[in-house]
Structure formats: structure tokens, C-alpha cells
Interface confidence: medium
């Protein structure tokens, strides 16, 4: 807390300018009017205030706006944003995408801080849903943003927003998140032709069910191994050797290198060994010839 001291003669700030960088903390507190600061916030970012001085400027704004800053001030916070706590930000009502962009720009190049996470949360909640423009903006600054959302939060993403998603945006998503995103992507891209569709849907396939993988195997898509390895194990297990061969095309040879890893390992255990042998890859671990395979799940469904 900065002590209240009288402003020295001739030091009263008439405007926010760079002469203030040589004011001591107590001088800033005493000589800068909070209302003046609020109306000239756009100048603060152009002045190389020290960290200590920014603390004082924040304190002045906090006193002026105890219930939270108005958006006209928030938009021009600049580096002062880095001084805000999540508690401060929870008091804000940010509705303009321009304001969001301006604040994200300040934090550019750094990992998502608790302040930024709170800001985004406030913004998205205020909008009611994660629209395309917002998603475009957020993933541009934080490629991993989508994967930081819970499945419940992702359910509010409209299919139209999926067009903004790039493959790298989904790198850290887990299967539960892809389960939510995949149906939205399927809906968003449904009018595209085969090869274009596959290019777009590929990143989301970690949420695809068996029937969609079977359908893709009929379309000569040549799925790469990296994508195959991210598929849901339960979706891969029912695929036949022929279907996997069609799905992977020339990439089928990569199965050998991945035979000890899921989902390939579990899939191998479900296939007849002589079917696996037709691939000519030396995959071992399939069901020996002559064994009867009972699909207990199917039997339960019938009874």
C-alpha cells in the first residue's frame, strides 16, 4: 500500500506522459489523478513504466473502480494487464473481441497464465458459446486452447466453429474431448467430397466410432500410422484385417513397428492369425487356426 503524501509543488500530472517514468511511487500516487489515468490509459502502454510504477497505476485504477474496470479501460490496459490477478479479472465484463485480442497480444509468446485463462472464461461465458471468430482468435494465440476445455465446455462449440480448428490445435486433446469434437466435425464437413473430407476430418478421428472407420476404409483414404495410433481402441477392435488394410493403404506396413502398442496390440489379439498372415508383415499374437471366436457382447445383446 502506497502512503498518502502531498504532491510536491509543480509535479501534478496534467497528462499521462513519459516524464512520469522518473516519478517515485509515492509521487505517482500523490500526483496522478485516477480519472485522468482512466481516460488516458491508451498512453500507458507507450511509456516504459517500471514494474513498481505499474503497481501504483493499478492501485489507482482499483480505487477508482472497486467493482471492476469498464471495458473502455480494459481495452487499453496493455502491459498493466500482466499485473491483474484472476480475482481482478472476474469482476470484468468483456464483450468485445477487440478487447480480448488486445489483452492476448500482451501475453503473446508466453504460456497461458491463470489471468488469461480467467479472461477467456469470462469472455466465452459472456458470449454464451464459443463462436467461430472467438475460436479463431483463441487458437491463433494458444494452439492448445481447445484441448484445455472440458468435454462439457466443448459441447457448447457450434459445428460451424470447427472450420477454424487446425490439426495442431488438437495435439493435446484426449479421447473424451475428441468424442465431443468428432461429431461436430463430421457435421461441419459433411458436404465435402471424399479426399477433401478426409483431410479435414483426420485430426478429429480419435473420436470416431467403428462404423465411420469402416466407411472410411471403403474410400481409399490411406490413413497414416500416426492417425491410426490415435484412434479409439474400442473403435479399432471390430475392424477386420481387410478393413484395416484398406484403411491404411500403403501405410499398412507400419503396423509391424507398432505391434506392441495400443491399439495395434489389442487389435492383433482379436484377429485370426491366418488373416494377419495375409498381410505378410510377420504380425504375431493372433487367434490360432481352429479356435472358435465367441463374440460375447453380441450374445448378450441377443439374449
Amino acid at each position: 500500500e502506497v502512503e498518502k503524501t502531498a504532491c510536491p509543488s509543480g509535479k501534478k500530472a496534467r497528462e499521462i506522459d513519459e516524464s512520469l517514468i522518473f516519478y517515485k511511487k509515492w509521487e505517482l500516487e500523490a500526483c496522478v489523478d485516477a480519472a485522468l489515468l482512466a481516460t488516458q490509459m491508451d498512453r500507458v502502454n507507450a511509456i516504459p513504466f517500471t514494474y513498481e510504477q505499474l503497481d501504483v497505476l493499478k492501485h489507482k485504477l482499483d480505487e477508482l473502480y472497486p467493482q471492476g474496470y469498464p471495458e473502455s479501460v480494459i481495452q487499453h490496459l496493455g502491459y498493466l494487464f500482466l499485473k491483474m490477478s484472476p480475482e481482478d479479472i472476474r469482476k470484468w465484463n468483456v464483450t468485445s473481441l477487440e478487447t480480448l485480442k488486445a489483452l492476448l497480444e500482451v501475453n503473446k509468446g508466453h504460456e497461458m497464465s491463470p489471468q488469461v485463462a480467467t479472461l477467456i472464461d469470462r469472455f466465452v461465458k459472456g458470449r454464451g458459446q464459443l463462436d467461430k471468430d472467438t475460436l479463431d482468435t483463441l487458437t491463433a494465440f494458444y494452439p492448445g486452447y481447445l484441448c484445455s476445455l472440458s468435454p462439457e465446455e466443448l459441447s457448447s462449440v457450434p459445428p460451424s466453429s470447427i472450420w477454424a480448428v487446425r490439426p495442431q490445435d488438437l495435439d493435446t486433446c484426449d479421447p473424451r474431448q475428441l468424442d465431443v469434437l468428432y461429431p461436430k466435425a463430421r457435421l461441419a464437413f459433411q458436404n465435402m467430397n471424399g479426399s477433401e473430407y478426409f483431410v479435414k476430418i483426420q485430426s478429429f478421428l480419435g473420436g470416431a466410432p467403428t462404423e465411420d472407420l469402416k466407411a472410411l476404409s471403403q474410400q481409399n483414404v490411406s490413413m497414416d500410422l500416426a492417425t491410426f495410433m490415435k484412434l479409439r481402441t474400442d473403435a479399432v477392435l471390430p475392424l477386420t484385417v481387410a478393413e484395416v488394410q484398406k484403411l491404411l493403404g500403403p501405410h499398412v506396413e507400419g503396423l509391424k513397428a507398432e505391434e506392441r502398442h495400443r491399439p495395434v496390440r489389442d487389435w492383433i489379439l482379436r484377429q485370426r492369425q491366418d488373416d494377419l498372415d495375409t498381410l505378410g508383415l510377420g504380425l504375431q499374437g493372433g487367434i490360432p487356426n481352429g479356435y472358435l471366436v465367441l463374440d460375447l457382447s453380441m450374445q448378450e445383446a441377443l439374449s
Epitope: 506522459d17 513519459e18 517514468i21 522518473f22 517515485k24 511511487k25 516504459p48 517500471t50 514494474y51 513498481e52
Partner: antibody, heavy 116, light 111 residues
């Protein structure tokens, strides 16, 4: 890459004058306040003076106030320190540095020796 | 006489953790951020820590800063021979005459 290169140091008699220069590159010079920090032989660091980005505001340590003048030419990306009425205790390596508290980049320094 | 007080020397063996203290007053460390600089013989100082405990990019996480009241400290863990240098603390000063004030420096020797 940020570069700060000082020049103008040398041997001067007590009461004499010297002008130090610091050529800056690799950043928008006019956007940054700049400072001079000195270090007497075998001693610690001492802040000397600072100037705002436009040059409109200056600040000095008590030990040099009235004798030293800091200035800058933003068109030449150059910082200056005009030193008058030099004393033997001004003998030091003078560093040009970016900022007014967080000195994030420093020049290699130029030696000023005040001796009769 | 420096306004901030540092021990003139400190030492440690490779791998050890060494701490350098910096003591000030309410007008500097007590009410402002602390900065630490590293200086090798014959070269310019380099910013090591700013805002009490923040490291600029490129500074190893073996270096950490902290502040409590009117004192601050720099800790170096996993000491290496290349850490042998002079270390200076600094802070803005809110007293009438001060602006930025430095400690006297600590010579760190790696045994």
C-alpha cells in the same frame, strides 16, 4: 539482436570534460528509456543517469547532478553523456544500458580515467 | 557506501546450493522489486533476475530469487564452475535522493 556500443572514454585531467556516446541497434531505440551505470576499478555498480524515450525527461544521481548531462539523438540511435568538471572519483568504466530499473541489455563499457 | 548490503564473498563446491543475501530498507527493497545481475571479470553485467523472482529467457532455472520484507536473496542450486562471478542486487529507491541503488556485490567462488 540488441547491441549497445560505448565510445568516447579516455584519460582526462580533473576539471576537464568528456563526451561518451552509445550506439544502439537491434531494437526501436526511441521506445526505450536508457541509462548510464558506472563501475569504479575494483568496486561495485553505481547508477548515474537516465533519460526517457523521447529525451524529454532526465534524471541524475546526486553525485553527478549539475556536472553531467544525458541526452539522445533518436534519428541516430545514439545515447550521450556529457561529463563536465570531472573529478578523480569519476574514474570508472561507464556502461550504457537499456531501461531505467530493469537493465536488460548492457554495452561492453568505456573506461574514463580522471587523473593529473 | 552502497545502500544495499551484500556479503563481500560466498563460496561453494560444484553441485551445492549457495545463497547470496541482500539487505536494504523500507524505501528500496521494502517497497520495490529486487533485481540481480551477474558479472564476469572484464565483462558487462547481465540481468539474472527481475521483479524479485522472474528469470529472463536464457537464464537457467538453477538461479532463483526471493524477497521478504527489506531483504532479498539469490539462490544458485547445482553450482557449476562457470557460476564463479560477481553478483549484484539492485532496487529502485523511493527516498528523496535515490533512484536505482545497487548492492556492493558478492564475489562467488566455486571451490
Amino acid at each position: 539482436e540488441v547491441h549497445l556500443v560505448e565510445s568516447g572514454g579516455g584519460l582526462v585531467q580533473p576539471g576537464g570534460s568528456l563526451r561518451l556516446s552509445c550506439a544502439a541497434s537491434g531494437f526501436t531505440f526511441s521506445s526505450y528509456a536508457m541509462s548510464w551505470v558506472r563501475q569504479a576499478p575494483g568496486k561495485g555498480l553505481e547508477w548515474v543517469s537516465a533519460i526517457s524515450g523521447s529525451g524529454g525527461s532526465t534524471y541524475y544521481a546526486d553525485s553527478v547532478k549539475g556536472r553531467f548531462t544525458i541526452s539522445r539523438d533518436n534519428s541516430k540511435n545514439t545515447l550521450y553523456l556529457q561529463m563536465n568538471s570531472l573529478k578523480t572519483e569519476d574514474t570508472a568504466v561507464y556502461y550504457c544500458t537499456r531501461g531505467v530499473a530493469t537493465f536488460d541489455y548492457w554495452g561492453q563499457g568505456t573506461l574514463v580515467t580522471v587523473s593529473s | 557506501q552502497p545502500v544495499l548490503t551484500q556479503p563481500p564473498s560466498a563460496s561453494g563446491t560444484p553441485g551445492q546450493r549457495v545463497t547470496i543475501s541482500c539487505s536494504g530498507s523500507s524505501s528500496n527493497i521494502g517497497s520495490n522489486y529486487v533485481y540481480w545481475y551477474q558479472q564476469f571479470p572484464g565483462t558487462a553485467p547481465k540481468l539474472l533476475i527481475y521483479m524479485n523472482n522472474q528469470r529472463p529467457s536464457g537464464v537457467p532455472d538453477r538461479f532463483s530469487g526471493s524477497k521478504s520484507g527489506t531483504s532479498a536473496s539469490l539462490a544458485i542450486s547445482g553450482l557449476r564452475s562457470e557460476d564463479e562471478a560477481d553478483y549484484y542486487c539492485a532496487a529502485r529507491d523511493d527516498s528523496l535522493s535515490g533512484y536505482v541503488t545497487f548492492g556492493g556485490g558478492t564475489k562467488l567462488t566455486v571451490l
